[in-house]
């Protein structure tokens, strides 16, 4: 019996420009000869539904049809017929089958790749046109992948240690695509510093699909109006 | 920094078994397959078998199979080698070798090796 | 299983002179236009350190007085100008089929 197991989930999601393996082992009831049997491996591109060869495995003889593609022989002794693509890219996303022959059974599995790009997060300070007493922050966010995006704004004082949302004067633009794909936006926060305390820290926090866990910047307000406090300048920019 | 750790130098008996570690740091775990070698004193080195993290399939020189098995935990990003029925002549230094199994087969990252001392 | 036999068993040449260092195997270790031939370094007390892999690619920090050669059987380690830090023993490996062997090694060591 031959048997073909992919990513359980069906689903594998990779980072933008990484070396990404994408799972396929293979289960026989015998022990494996790599010289007599063939690998398959085809992509379906999200936007159109043709299939695409990628790479191919048969005895002596190994062809990748996408440059770097590779299915390590070594791995293909004890039963993994992973296929490695080095700097995967966007476009690269879809549907990957692994069609695995030992004459005369055949064996198959899919598996859908997602490609994310992290958003990296930086804070500025916008002074331009402001009236006095106001401040204008801006939360940029860049270079993401898909492109839902959730940006939220909080603050901490003193008396409040724990984060309270901020839903007034909050505005966020609309994402603007980049050359590559990868997306931008924009979110602003509108500050009446006479009316804040000083040492009120605020933080820009977003939420992607990419990130296992928020992407948080953070300035405080100090007395001295439009000044930015060490803990932006050194520990929030990614 | 690619780094392989071994655990501490060990005193067997004959018909005993050990167990080596191998904990590795500074790459993903299951970009490379770990392989196991040893060294008898003044002797040259000698290939166990390897182990791919995974899936947990693994290759075993005939020499050592049924005597020898590889495991890991991928968890914790280890490797284990465990020899069964030892002898006298299995006293050696065993190490663990990263494998880069994708564009050739090499070990490009050694352990520092553990000792098996197997005396009556 | 492959057969890997190393000449010379010893060798002793002075500092800045070439050394070289040969290495036969029992049948072809050629897989689909490459070698999987591989040379390793070990200095006592010390785990072995690759220096070249596939025949003739250079492992990352190694000195480029190191170099391989060679396909199918027969395969070649040269040190273009002996350092006295290259006194060690030098082993070739073939990794095309299993089990994976070592040549019986090299000990090079200074005239």
């Known amino acids: 019996d031959l048997k073909v197991e992919m990513m359980a989930g069906g689903t594998q999601i990779t980072p933008l420009n990484d070396n990404v393996t994408i799972f396929c082992n293979i289960f026989y009831s015998q022990p494996l000869n790599i010289t007599s049997m063939g690998i398959t491996w085809f992509w379906k591109s999200l936007t159109f539904d043709k299939e695409v060869k990628v790479f191919e495995f048969f005895g002596d003889h190994q062809e990748a049809f996408r440059p770097g593609a590779i299915v390590s022989p070594w791995r293909l002794k004890s039963g993994d017929a992973s296929l490695r693509l080095p700097g995967i890219q966007l476009e690269e996303a879809g549907e990957y089958r692994c069609e695995v022959v030992v004459t005369p059974l055949k064996a198959q599995g899919t598996v859908q790749l997602e490609v994310v790009a992290s958003p990296a997060s930086r804070l500025l300070l916008d002074q331009v046109g402001m009236k006095e007493n106001e401040d204008k922050y801006m939360c940029e966010s860049s270079g993401f992948y898909p492109e839902a995006i959730n940006i939220t704004w909080e603050k901490q004082t003193q008396k409040f240690p724990h984060p309270i949302e901020i839903s007034e004067d909050v505005i966020t633009g609309p994402t603007i695509k980049n050359m590559d794909g990868t997306f931008n936006v924009t979110s602003c926060l509108k500050l009446n510093s006479s009316q804040e305390d000083p040492g009120t820290v605020y933080q820009c926090v977003v939420r992607h699909a990419s990130l296992h866990t928020p992407l948080r910047s953070n300035f405080t307000l100090t007395a001295a109006r439009h000044s930015l406090s060490e803990t932006e300048k050194t520990d929030n920019f990614s | 920094e690619v780094q392989l750790v071994q655990s501490g130098a060990e005193v067997k008996k004959p018909g005993a078994s050990v167990k080596v570690s191998c904990k590795a740091s500074g790459y993903t775990f299951t970009d490379y397959n770990m392989d196991w070698v040893r060294q008898a004193p003044g002797q040259g080195l000698e290939w166990i078998g390897d182990?791919?993290?995974?899936?947990?399939?693994?290759l075993y020189n005939q020499k050592f199979r049924g005597r020898v098995t590889l495991t890991v935990d991928t968890s914790i990003s280890t490797a284990y080698m465990e020899l069964s029925r030892l002898r006298s002549d299995d006293t050696a230094v065993y190490y663990c070798?990263?494998?880069?199994?994708?564009?050739?087969?090499?070990?490009?990252?050694w352990g520092q090796g553990t000792t098996v001392t197997v005396s009556s | 299983d492959i057969v890997l036999t190393q000449s010379p068993d010893s060798l002793a040449v002075s500092l800045g002179e070439r050394a070289t260092i040969n290495c036969k195997a029992s049948?072809?270790?050629?897989?689909?236009?490459?070698?999987?031939m591989n040379w390793y370094q070990q200095k006592p007390g010390q785990p072995p350190k690759l220096l070249i892999y596939?025949?003739?690619t250079l492992h990352s920090g190694v000195p480029d007085r190191f170099s391989g050669s060679g396909s199918g059987t027969d395969f070649t380690l040269t040190i273009s100008s002996l350092q006295a830090e290259d006194v060690a023993v030098y082993y070739c490996?073939?990794?095309?089929?299993?089990?994976?062997?070592f040549g019986q090694g090299t000990k090079l060591e200074i005239k």
């Open positions: 596939a025949a003739s």
């Open positions: 490996q073939q990794s095309k089929e299993d089990p994976r062997t």
């Open positions: 049948q072809s270790v050629d897989y689909d236009g490459d070698s999987y």
């Open positions: 070798a990263r494998s880069e199994v994708f564009y050739g087969n090499y070990a490009d990252y």
């Open positions: 182990i791919n993290p995974n899936n947990g399939g693994t």
